[in-house]
Interface confidence: low
Amino acid sequence: MRTEAQVPALQPPEPGLEGAMGHRTLVLPWVLLTLCVTAGTPEVWVQVRMEATELSSFTIRCGFLGSGSISLVTVSWGGPNGAGGTTLAVLHPERGIRQWAPARQARWETQSSISLILEGSGASSPCANTTFCCKFASFPEGSWEACGSLPPSSDPGLSAPPTPAPILRADLAGILGVSGVLLFGCVYLLHLLRRHKHRPAPRLQPSRTSPQAPRARAWAPSQASQAALHVPYATINTSCRPATLDTAHPHGGPSWWASLPTHAAHRPQGPAAWASTPIPARGSFVSVENGLYAQAGERPPHTGPGLTLFPDPRGPRAMEGPLGVR
């Protein structure tokens, strides 16, 4: 028996295309629309549950609904990693898993989903109003994050399927090329739709068997971007016994290769020093956000002007690719 909560889905209306377009004419728009939706708006889902047998034990499950290659997953407590959250675990598909108290067990469930068990007793247990966030760094989609917490009722046994809640990172420098193509396609699609808008015809009902008919996930690009931009992060605020800080992992995380901006994530700071040349210099904690590597902290006097990267035990090959992805 367990208590579960999921972040609410951003459910778009099903697109109804007006106009008397023939089936052939529809193929391109539907393909473009599919591209705009599936490639342009990957999603992250978060599921938080409290074990009824052990009320101080939480399980967080997160997954990435996208076609890209995941290069890093960060689970944080208390809000998004870049906005005050503190890291509980970092999972890298090749370089291993690091976790901190009160995280007990972090693991990959599938190639695109992870789970994390948090333990605690008394003062050190996570509270039901704690927000847990999962951030997926992937290529070519970039960084996507979603957050969730337990519902106010916290009734053991409450269960629902996990639902996606995307966050748009509009400044992903590493995917400008892909974005440009998609943007062009989306604009072209809108142009086609507008051109045929005033032609009277019955509303199109996409065929269930048609590969060009994405249903639940097919939402217009404008809706997608607006919804994502207007939701800085999806979270449910709940209440329970007074929250404790004993569950926090300090300032966000480990000294992993190219990881997350932790130092700047918890205090208002000046802009991070950005470096675009992936040259390993010394171990440090840097960001893969936006396809660039951000040095997360002051550079010691002996460190050169190059990028501060974690020296990967597997050698220089580990640093290939825009996000360390080969």
Epitope: G78, T86, R95, G96, R98, Q99, W100, A101, S124, L245, D246, T247, A248, H249, P250, H251, G252, G253, P254, S255, T262, H263, H266, R267, R282, G283, S284, F285, A296, G297, F310, P311, P313
Partner: antibody
Amino acid sequence: EVQLQQSGPELVKPGASVRISCKASGYTFTDYNMHWVKQSHGKSLEWIGYIYPYNGGTGHNQNFKSKATLTVDKSSSTAYMEFRSLTSDDSAVYYCAREDFRHEKMDYWGQGTSVTVSS
Amino acid sequence: DIQMTQSPASLSASVGETVTITCRTSDNIYVYLSWYQQKQGKSPQLLVYNAKTLTENVPSRFSGSGSGTQFSLKINSLQPEDFGSYYCQHHYGTPYTFGGGTKLEIK
């Protein structure tokens, strides 16, 4: 210059509690973990736990979870460790150590506080 | 918890010699390992972090190597000030643990 100044030696009775302080200077106190380490006479080092001054978040070695309480006073840039229910096994030198925010290293250590538990 | 096995427990060497201290971990800790030097009655001093990165102002005769579960600290051309105790420590998540230490004495 980064400095961690610990409180002086303590002689306490079994069953009592002791509170050790570690005053930090020369850096932004809330930006770094503060760790506590125990060293019994002639023995190795034992990690007790850490506190992150920015939000009070802590992590403990389970062996010390019921024994040590870690707190900070941000206004004075001071970290505290309270040790309770002391026994002769708790007689040791206790160090505070700053850990850089990338979790790479404990780069600065206090001079140590000697605690002797004796009746 | 990750166990740290440091060897040898004690070591006698002469000035000018080269010595190597090893540290083995029970689990893969990648390169999340530090080496400390401690003199009698003093606090530990960080020598090496991330397995092989030398701390500022530490002489280049010290060098760290290894990854995964096997690590070593090498001291070339021992100097009188190098004698003392050495400890390895992992920082691959909590709880951090230290090795049992190596006491380096003058022969």
